[in-house]
């Protein structure tokens, strides 16, 4: 029975050249989190955080992705091409798979705000 919910930072914006934190939080379940995957809109994996093995950043993103804080992910040196959907996937037992969505908009404008509010997608 999957009782949990994923809360995410929802829709966020950040400045080109800057950095942004992608955060998800699993609540309302006692399930063990065995792994968290971070994926881009085109299904490419950015990083994996395994409960036993720790972080694995995929080679294509090693220069621009930093693990954390917590189970979150920090994207650095943002470009306009980074605009789009990001997904956190929580693999848990005994529940199974939970997925959260974040939409990141990278702005040229110097007035871009990084919103850190959490919402349930």
């Amino acid at each position: 029975m999957m009782t949990g919910t994923i809360e995410t930072t929802g829709n966020i914006s950040a400045k080109k050249g800057g950095s942004v934190i992608l955060q998800c939080h699993l609540s309302s379940t006692m399930a063990q989190v065995t792994q968290v995957n971070w994926e881009q809109h085109d299904h490419s994996l950015l990083a994996i955080r395994n409960a036993e093995l720790g972080w694995h950043i995929y080679p294509a993103f090693k220069d621009r992705v930093a693990p954390g804080p917590g189970l979150g992910l920090t994207l650095q040196s943002l470009t306009m091409n980074d605009t789009g959907e990001y997904f956190c996937t929580y693999h848990t037992y005994p529940d199974g798979t939970y997925r959260g969505r974040i939409f990141l908009e990278v702005l040229e404008s110097s007035v871009a705000e990084h919103s850190a509010r959490f919402q349930i997608p």
């Epitope: 994996i48 036993e52 529940d95 199974g96 798979t97």
Partner: antibody, heavy 119, light 107 residues
Framework: EVQLVESGGGLVKPGGSLKLSCAAS????????MSWVRQSPEKRLEWVAE????????YHPDTVTGRFTISRDNAKNTLYLEMSSLRSEDTAMYYC????????????WGQGTSVTVSS | DVQITQSPSYLAASPGETITINCRAS??????LAWYQEKPGKTNKLLIY???TLQSGIPSRFSGSGSGTDFTLTISSLEPEDFAMYYC?????????FGGGTKLEIK
């Protein structure tokens, strides 16, 4: 080349025990969760156990909980399935399979080892 | 447990044809369905995972679609080596469960 080779199957009487092994090669064994899946004589597939890369997490469906135990020896690159209190309905081909690094599905399977439970 | 109903259980087709195999889950499994090919004397092969993602090394004539409860495997322009047994499996929640299989034979 990824290879998974199962062994240890055979004929066993109801109530008996058996220990299956799966020798893995061609990849860093400890980086991958592993599963056992069985196929009945009627060709139905059933997942029977899973273990995380480091061995800290083990999972079994209700049908085999308390009777089957999955384990691994990362130093020997070997996966195990210890089966006890065997029943006729446990008769099947048993396959070991590697889970994808991202935990989505099973990307490599072995050839299987046959288990027959009969008096 | 999530029940997976796979149809048809048997399918006859000719090389060059396009075929579809369907799997229906007893409740929503999001996009988390995988497809496997089974051939005698060979190890099972992962074709598609997460509903539509093609496993590395699998020809592009294989494609998957669907989400929620209804999923489809499509094989376009069948090749002689495609005649085999096909299974779907949900990887959304424990226990992982499989469809009953589809035997694809040459007409």
């Amino acid at each position: 080349e990824v290879q998974l080779v199962e062994s240890g199957g055979g004929l066993v009487k109801p109530g008996g025990s058996l220990k299956l092994s799966c020798a893995a090669s061609g990849f860093t064994f400890s980086n991958y969760a592993m599963s056992w899946v069985r196929q009945s004589p009627e060709k139905r597939l059933e997942w029977v156990a899973e273990i995380s890369g480091g061995g800290s997490y083990t999972y079994h469906p209700d049908t085999v909980t308390g009777r089957f135990t999955i384990s691994r020896d990362n130093a020997k690159n070997t996966l195990y399935l210890e089966m006890s209190s065997l029943r006729s309905e446990d008769t099947a081909m048993y396959y070991c399979a590697r889970k994808r690094r991202d935990y989505y599905a099973m990307d490599y399977w072995g050839q299987g080892t046959s288990v027959t439970v009969s008096s | 447990d999530v029940q997976i109903t796979q149809s048809p259980s048997y399918l006859a087709a000719s090389p060059g044809e396009t075929i579809t195999i369907n799997c229906r889950a007893s409740k929503s499994i999001s996009k988390y369905l995988a497809w496997y090919q089974e051939k005698p004397g060979k190890t099972n092969k992962l074709l598609i995972y997460s509903g539509s993602t093609l496993q590395s090394g699998i020809p592009s004539r294989f494609s998957g679609s669907g989400s929620g409860t209804d999923f489809t495997l499509t094989i376009s322009s069948l090749e002689p080596e495609d005649f085999a047994m096909y299974y779907c499996q949900q990887h959304n929640e424990y226990p992982w469960t499989f469809g009953g299989g589809t035997k694809l034979e040459i007409k």
